[in-house]
């Protein structure tokens, strides 16, 4: 009976996500059969988050809207380990919007989810950011420095990275 009610709860939770994500890939967390963590099927997972590389080229605002339609945001990078995971799935000749912008052109950078911007945990290419007109951040590859961040014009279409919390059922 307990197992039955647990299954019913899981099914109702899965239905919530079905409108965005018809298919989920779930893995057992730890040894307890009752705890499963899921990501939408084409997404990748790292720690407590799911990631999706959007290859459609859109402005920063449209990219963020595209992520939010899927129940996600443009990616907020909190650690070097997280960035190292993300770059495994990126193409060197492409640039990808991050969830980081400077809306007023005042060099006051902010993350889409209101995570405080910490200068000590940023991965800007050397000499970046460097332009008041470039209010949105991308991650891209430079042969001299590998992967890092750059500020660019928000309206210039780029690929993007979406991030959402894992779904626990």
């Amino acid at each position: 009976n307990f197992m039955y009610s647990k299954t019913v709860k899981r099914l109702s939770k899965l239905r919530e996500y079905q409108q965005y994500h018809p298919s989920l890939t779930c893995v057992m967390e730890g040894k307890d059969i009752e705890d499963w963590s899921c990501c939408p099927t084409p997404w990748t997972s790292f720690q407590s988050s799911c990631y999706f590389i959007s290859t459609g080229m859109q402005s920063w605002t449209k990219s963020q809207k595209n992520c939010s339609v899927m129940g996600a945001d443009l990616v907020v990078i909190n650690t070097r380990e997280e960035q190292d995971f993300i770059i495994q799935n990126l193409k060197r000749n492409s640039s990808y919007f991050l969830g980081l912008s400077d809306p007023g052109g005042r060099r006051h950078w902010q993350w889409v989810d209101q995570t405080p911007y910490n200068e000590n945990v940023t991965f800007w290419h050397s000499g970046e950011p460097n332009n008041l007109d470039e209010r949105c951040a991308i991650i891209n590859f430079r042969s001299s420095e590998e992967w890092g961040w750059n500020d660019i014009h928000c309206h210039v279409p780029q690929k993007s990275i979406c991030k959402m919390k894992k779904i626990y059922i």
Epitope: G104, G105, R106, G127, N130, N131, L132, D133, H153
Partner: antibody
């Protein structure tokens, strides 16, 4: 080539306002914000502020808030600066300058002389 | 606001000389230091940006160096057309600020 053409010299009475213009050509106007700089004998060069030609929003030096108002007209690729309630302290040469990479003003207008005198 | 100080307000040198103009910031400006040349007719041109990068079309006799709070502009082989006033400007923090200028004259 990049050119910033400013309006001509102004001789104005104290207490009135003046609006000076800066027409950008030879580049995509809305890709580069426009800065305004004051040069007076007493104070060398002073940064007044910057206006985004794309978004239309501005950042002012606190010292010039209430004195200067920056605007842009995308259709004519022209930036404007209005100076209000003029006094002799506002007599100076005013420059517009294009925003560039590395927090720099990469091209400058020829300057507009404003003389406030009764 | 960050204060920019050019201690030498005027400088006299001979044609062919090597001339150095210095600029000090009141705090670290992370190399966001630019140099401008103003000719006697009022024309202003960017020479050097981000401490040491030469703006397009600027002769290679101009060079820049420095870090932290201390920066300098060097003209290696003074030419008649270099007669002008030189200003430094920091772009690290709004409001952007300028040094008082150094007027260069020929002996």
């Amino acid at each position: 080539q990049v050119q910033l053409q400013q309006s001509g010299a102004e001789l104005v009475r104290p207490g009135v306002s003046v609006k000076i213009s800066c027409k950008g050509s030879g580049y995509t106007f809305t890709d580069y914000s426009m800065h305004w700089v004051k040069q007076s004998h007493a104070k060398s060069l002073e940064w007044i502020g910057v206006i985004s030609t794309y978004y239309g929003d501005s950042n002012y030096n606190q010292k010039f808030k209430g004195k200067a108002t920056m605007t842009v007209d995308k259709s004519s690729t022209t930036a404007y600066m209005e100076l209000a309630r003029l006094t002799s302290e506002d007599s100076a040469i005013y420059y517009c300058a294009r925003n560039g990479n590395f927090y720099v003003m990469d091209y400058w207008g020829q300057g507009t002389s404003v003389t406030v005198s009764s | 606001d960050i204060q920019m100080t050019q201690t030498t307000s005027s400088l006299s040198a001979s044609l062919g000389d090597r001339v150095t103009i210095s600029c000090r910031a009141s705090q670290d400006i992370s190399n966001y230091l630019n140099w401008y040349q103003q000719k006697p007719d009022g024309t202003v041109k960017l020479l050097i940006y981000y401490t040491s990068r030469l703006h397009s079309g600027v002769p290679s006799r101009f060079s820049g160096s420095g870090s932290g709070t201390d920066y300098s502009l060097t003209i290696s082989n003074l030419d008649q057309e270099d007669i002008a006033t030189y200003f430094c400007q920091q772009g690290n923090t709004l409001p952007w600020t300028f040094g008082g200028g150094t007027k260069l004259e020929i002996k």
